[in-house]
Interface confidence: low
């Protein structure tokens, strides 16, 4: 505990390592013939305290013993945990200009004795691994602390390893470098950790374990799957394992799933049959192992095997709908539409659809395959027709779905009543209706069909539809519904051989239109004025237009204009008014109204009727 320096020595009592809360005496002594020249009595020894290389205190006032000019003893208290540096310097008081000269220094370490190590945990990775133990060291000692891990077992087996903790490294784990073999499966082993530093020592409680307690098998490797006869639902999972494994846990899931299917397999010997897989589905498989049925630890999960199950022929029924359009007196165009099967029904990549149109008396059959989800043909208007569609993948085809081609809106008695369309939120519309009042045949199902009321939508875009059971009188439509767009919604009631429909317009959100209709002409016929206009461009309508309003007033008049409100009909683009005085010049304009309000006015036109007014 003495640091030999040129000018003198510094000693510490009781020791340079002390427990927290203890005091220490530091003595600084000059060597013979050292000190201030000529006047030994002018030697003044001072003690400086440094923490982290920063001067924090001059201990001049803590002097407890002084041999003038030869040695001084200082008492230091309240030292904080860790290392503190003390430097003794010589101050020659007769020479104020010279700085104090360093004599010697000492480092004092303040710490605590180690706590008994706790929570010892040992593990051997695989049958050929080595035993490694970790523990909780307890509170930081702030001193270099040595740890000894000792293992003892049968046949006088003993083994020990050491490591230390200090301010740079932490010792809470040691690998003993020995391998426990399965033939010692029933044997008991004891480990103990001893901690020792300059302030004391402590020992853990003995920790007892068996081979099975600590050996964690290596995860299975070389995982593969064999699909029996290219089946999409049955496969044999195979893997390699360590020799002593008796229990496996398998987990597998479709890649987009959030929950695993779990299977326990005893004595599987690297093989297990799975029977409930979904065809044409990306799966992830993992396996874990255990060396004993009741004791021991599971291995980590193996690396994932990711693979797609093979295809199987499609199942399920295609959802078919159609449109009929008369071309002339003896021909009609039939457009068939169907929805793609969902993946669990398609069970593979759909390569094509088989479409059949057949006259019921079997006189005519039209057949085709298509990769699209629609098909159009011109057929005679005579006869009763039926259509069927099936979906095919590489393994086969689904059962055909049949639909009778009837006149969808041909039977007034089958028309649903009180059809309404209410906006529910930005992207759906609630459609409700009442059943037909006097249907002479039972309603088998309702079809709610909708399409945007925009130019060319019948030819450009397929319809959207929902099939509704006959006892339901409402449907929430959301597919392809956008705000500020007006949709034509039809509710069809279908019986076995007839159809009736009712139509309504609806939107999911609306605003007042951006502009009013543009008046294109005002003509006078038989004492009535006919106002003609062009409809508001589709993007500017911003929902379903309920009314048009025609305003007029005498030119230069300050009176309120008169107005005529007309129900909006897409097909109508002119309207008569008959309350204008002859030979008076009027200004006329139009606006459009949605459920959200009225548009700004359209263009103004002046007109002076000539004829006799009513």
């Amino acid at each position: 505990n003495i640091d030999v320096c040129k000018l003198g020595t510094v000693t510490v009592q009781p020791a340079p390592v002390i427990p927290l809360g203890s005091a220490a005496n530091i003595s600084c002594s000059l060597n013979p013939k050292q000190g201030c020249s000529h006047y030994p009595s002018s030697n003044e020894l001072i003690l400086l305290k440094f923490v982290n290389d920063v001067l924090v205190e001059n201990l001049h006032g803590k002097k407890v013993h002084d041999h003038t000019g030869h040695s001084s003893t200082f008492q230091v208290t309240n030292l904080s945990l860790g290392m503190t540096l003390f430097v003794c310097k010589l101050n020659c008081s007769n020479s104020q200009k010279k700085p104090p000269v360093p004599v010697c220094g000492v480092e004092i370490s303040v710490g605590v004795a180690p706590e008994p190590p706790q929570n010892i945990s040992c593990v051997q990775e695989g049958e050929n691994g080595t035993v490694a133990c970790s523990w909780n060291s307890g509170k930081v000692t702030y001193l270099k602390t040595n740890y000894t891990l000792q293992l003892s077992g049968p046949n006088n087996l003993t083994c020990q390893k050491q490591c230390f903790s200090d301010n740079r490294q932490n010792c809470n784990r040691l690998d003993l470098g020995i391998n426990l073999s399965p033939d010692l499966a029933e044997s008991r082993f004891i480990v103990r950790v001893t901690a020792i530093n300059d302030l004391g020592n402590s020992s853990s409680l003995p920790h007892t374990f068996t081979f099975l307690d600590i050996v964690i098998p290596l995860p299975p490797w070389d995982i593969r799957i064999n699909f029996l006869n290219a089946s999409g639902s049955r496969g044999t999972l195979q893997w390699e394992d360590e020799g002593q494994v008796v229990l496996n846990q398998l987990r597998y899931q479709p890649l987009n799933s959030t929950s695993w299917n779990m299977v326990n397999a005893t004595n599987a010997k690297g093989k297990y049959d799975l029977r409930d897989l979904r065809p044409f589905t990306e799966y992830e498989f993992q396996i874990s192992s255990k060396l004993h049925l009741s004791g021991g630890s599971w291995s980590n999960w193996s690396e994932s095997l990711r693979t797609r199950t093979p295809e199987e022929e499609p199942v399920g029924i295609l959802d078919i709908w159609y449109m009929k359009q008369d071309i002339d007196y003896d021909r009609q165009q039939i457009s068939l539409f169907w929805k793609s099967l969902n993946p669990s029904e398609a069970r593979g990549k759909i390569l094509h659809y088989q479409v059949t149109l057949q006259e019921v008396t079997k006189k005519t059959t039209l057949q085709n395959t298509t990769r699209h989800t629609s098909w159009t043909r011109v057929i005679p208007r005579t006869g009763a027709w039926t259509a069927s569609v099936s979906a095919a993948n590489s393994k086969g085809a689904s059962a055909p779905t049949h639909i009778n081609i009837v006149d969808l809106c041909g039977t007034g008695l089958l028309a649903p009543h009180q059809v309404s369309a209410k906006s529910e939120n930005m992207d759906n519309i609630l459609v409700t209706w009442q059943p037909p009042k006097k249907a002479d045949s039972a309603v088998r199902e309702y079809i709610v069909e909708w399409r945007a009321l925009q130019p060319g939508s019948i030819t450009k875009f397929p319809p959207h539809w929902l099939r509704i059971p006959p006892d339901n009188m409402s449907a929430l439509i959301s597919e392809n519904i956008k705000p500020y767009i007006c949709y034509e919604i039809r509710v069809h009631a279908l019986s076995e051989s007839q159809g009736g429909c009712s139509s309504i317009r609806g939107d999911s959100k609306h605003k007042a239109p951006v502009s009013g209709p543009h008046i294109t002409a005002i003509t006078e016929k038989k004492e009535r004025l006919f106002i003609s206009w062009t409809h508001i461009p589709f993007p500017e309508q911003r929902g379903c237009i309920l009314h048009y309003r025609i305003y007029w007033k005498e030119r230069d008049s300050t009176a309120q204009p008169e107005l005529c409100e007309i129900q909006y009909r897409r097909s109508q683009n002119s309207h008569p008014i008959s309350s204008l005085q002859p030979r008076v010049t009027y200004v006329l304009w139009m606006t459009a109204v949605t459920a959200a309000g009225e548009s700004p006015q359209g263009n103004e036109r002046e007109f002076c009727p000539q004829g006799k007014a009513n």
Partner: nanobody, 129 residues
Framework: QVQLQESGGGLVQAGGSLRLSCAAS????????MAWFRQAPGTEREFVAG?????????FYDDSVKGRFAISRDSAKNTVWLQMNSLKPEDTAVYYC?????????????????????WGQGTQVTVSS
């Protein structure tokens, strides 16, 4: 979806230093075991350093880097760092960041590739002599 993105690799002279960073997105990684592995051409991917993720974050190092490399994490920033000092030519490799979404406290498990369920794309470190 969880993603790990390494950065900070590059070319450095022997004896120099580099600091690798691994940014995790998609989940909070403060409780998960995190590790750095490396793979030199023609060799298996090997453990370099790891954090146990057991709340108190025990640090683990391969013997070959002990005293030279330091692993740390900033949970608030979802970032794990590897400070590499006194680099040697044999440290040349692609360095990968890995995360295990279950807490791992055994040294043996921390070292195993199979423990980790998320991996980054890697960053190249080249140490020239």
């Amino acid at each position: 979806q969880v993603q790990l993105q390494e950065s900070g690799g590059g070319l450095v002279q022997a004896g120099g230093s580099l600091r690798l960073s691994c940014a995790a997105s998609g989940r909070t990684f403060s409780n998960y075991a995190m590790a750095w592995f490396r793979q030199a051409p023609g060799t298996e991917r090997e453990f370099v350093a790891g954090l146990s993720g057991s709340g108190g974050d025990t640090e683990f190092y391969d013997d070959s880097v002990k005293g030279r490399f330091a692993i740390s994490r900033d949970s608030a920033k979802n970032t794990v760092w590897l400070q590499m000092n006194s680099l040697k030519p044999e440290d040349t490799a692609v360095y990968y960041c890995a995360a295990a979404t279950h807490v791992v406290v055994h040294y043996g498990l921390v070292r195993r590739r199979g423990t980790y369920d998320y991996w980054g794309q890697g960053t190249q470190v080249t140490v020239s002599s």
